[in-house]
């Protein structure tokens, strides 16, 4: 029934790596709550999850595009139009190297969400799927945020 039933490990790994707000100890939780900090902790946790979840959702959606009949609603129905929105259409004509340069200069960071731009671009590169596999492996071992920073800071030519 749900798109969420694939790619579980990379999502949960990313969430754990990015979240410094662990509260395994009930007594510590009580103490923090009495100081008025508890409620904001969960809000902060959700803040840290939001961008990463979106990256993972995009990856899952792209992976499931082959199964169009089964997953039609998930990527075809957006209120704004289709899944390929302004971000993807903008990136359509960008070569990977040009895109990274554009992103590093800061325009991409201001105009478009980093996670959308990166996933859209990576999903487009290498028809044989090898780059996608590489990206999946990386995401399995890095928090999404760390991966994004790493990608922005590393020249495409250095990685190929």
């Amino acid at each position: 029934r749900s798109l969420q039933d694939t790619e579980e490990k990379s999502r949960s790994f990313s969430a754990s790596q990015a979240d410094p707000l662990s509260d395994p100890d009930q007594m510590n939780e009580d103490k923090r709550h009495s100081q008025g900090t508890f409620t904001s902790d969960y809000s902060k946790y959700l803040d840290s999850r939001r961008a990463q979840d979106f990256v993972q959702w995009l990856m899952n959606t792209k992976r499931n595009r082959n199964n169009i009949a089964k997953r039609h609603d998930e990527f075809e129905r957006h209120a704004e139009g289709t899944f390929t929105s302004d971000v993807s259409s903008y990136l359509e004509g960008q070569a990977a190297k040009e895109f990274i340069a554009w992103l590093v200069k800061g325009r991409g960071r201001r105009d478009f969400p980093e996670e959308v731009a990166i996933v859209e671009e990576l999903g487009r590169r290498h028809a044989d799927g090898s780059f996608s596999d590489e990206m999946n492996t990386i995401l399995d071992n890095l928090a999404a945020r760390d991966f994004i920073n790493w990608l922005i800071q590393t020249k495409i030519t250095d990685r190929k």
Partner: antibody, heavy 119, light 112 residues
């Protein structure tokens, strides 16, 4: 298919304790955050508690803080809610809910177990 | 916490007609980084748990009939059932998942 089955509900006196369980199947339990959500006639649906996939993060709604403890046993695919110092306001149907890939979004729910706190 | 307010509390619509339920949040649930509204709709039938219909304000969960649609942004949202079927009789709840999750009080949908 995904299944969540709660148990442990019942009638209990104010001040007493109860432990709810939720047996999960049909998905990789150890990869998902889990929640308890309750539904009382007066209050409607109310989020109660969350535990991350590995149990390292636990959060609670203010009204149960210090009284309820959420936990999980990934080896048994089971979620728990230990409820202490129960009051009449805790009377509700308690649902366990699986978090989707998006935080705090509930894509699967159990059938619920009724907890009645009454003297 | 973000307060969710639904209207109306109850609604009676003829079979085949359009049903519209509104939901208002006390603060915006739009995440500017991805332009998504963190708003979900659930359906709850008698003696059953809630069932996820729509998330991100407008995306239908898999298996949900296309007569269900969601719209809105920021603080004002709408769930629309384009042609009411008998099996749609239920309570409907909105929920924000932008922050600590909170639900609307529910709307009871009946057949006129």
């Amino acid at each position: 298919q995904v299944q969540l089955v709660e148990s442990g509900g019942g009638v209990v006196q104010p001040g007493r304790s109860l432990r709810l369980s939720c047996a999960a199947s049909g998905f990789t339990f150890s990869s998902y955050g889990m929640h308890w959500v309750r539904q009382a006639p007066v209050k409607g649906l109310e989020w109660v508690a969350f535990i991350s996939f590995d149990g390292s993060n636990k959060y609670y709604t203010d009204s149960v803080k210090g009284r309820f403890t959420i936990s999980r046993d990934n080896s048994k695919n089971t979620l728990y809610l230990q409820m202490n110092s129960l009051t009449a306001e805790d009377t509700a149907i308690y649902y366990c809910a699986k978090e989707s890939i998006l935080a705090a979004l509930f894509d699967y729910w159990g059938q619920g177990t009724l907890v009645t706190v009454s003297s | 916490d973000i307060v969710m307010t639904q209207s109306p509390d109850s609604l009676a619509v003829s079979l085949g007609e359009r049903a519209t339920i509104n939901c208002k949040s006390s603060q915006s649930v739009l995440y500017s980084s991805n332009n998504k509204n963190y708003l979900a709709w659930y359906q709850q039938k008698p003696r059953q748990p809630p069932n996820l219909l729509i998330y991100w304000a407008s995306i239908r969960e898999s298996g949900v009939p296309d007569r269900f649609s969601g719209s809105g942004s920021g603080t004002d949202f709408t769930l629309t059932i384009s042609s009411l079927q008998a099996e749609d009789v239920a309570f409907y709840y909105c929920q924000q998942f932008y922050s600590i999750p909170t639900f609307g009080q529910g709307t009871k949908l009946e057949i006129k």
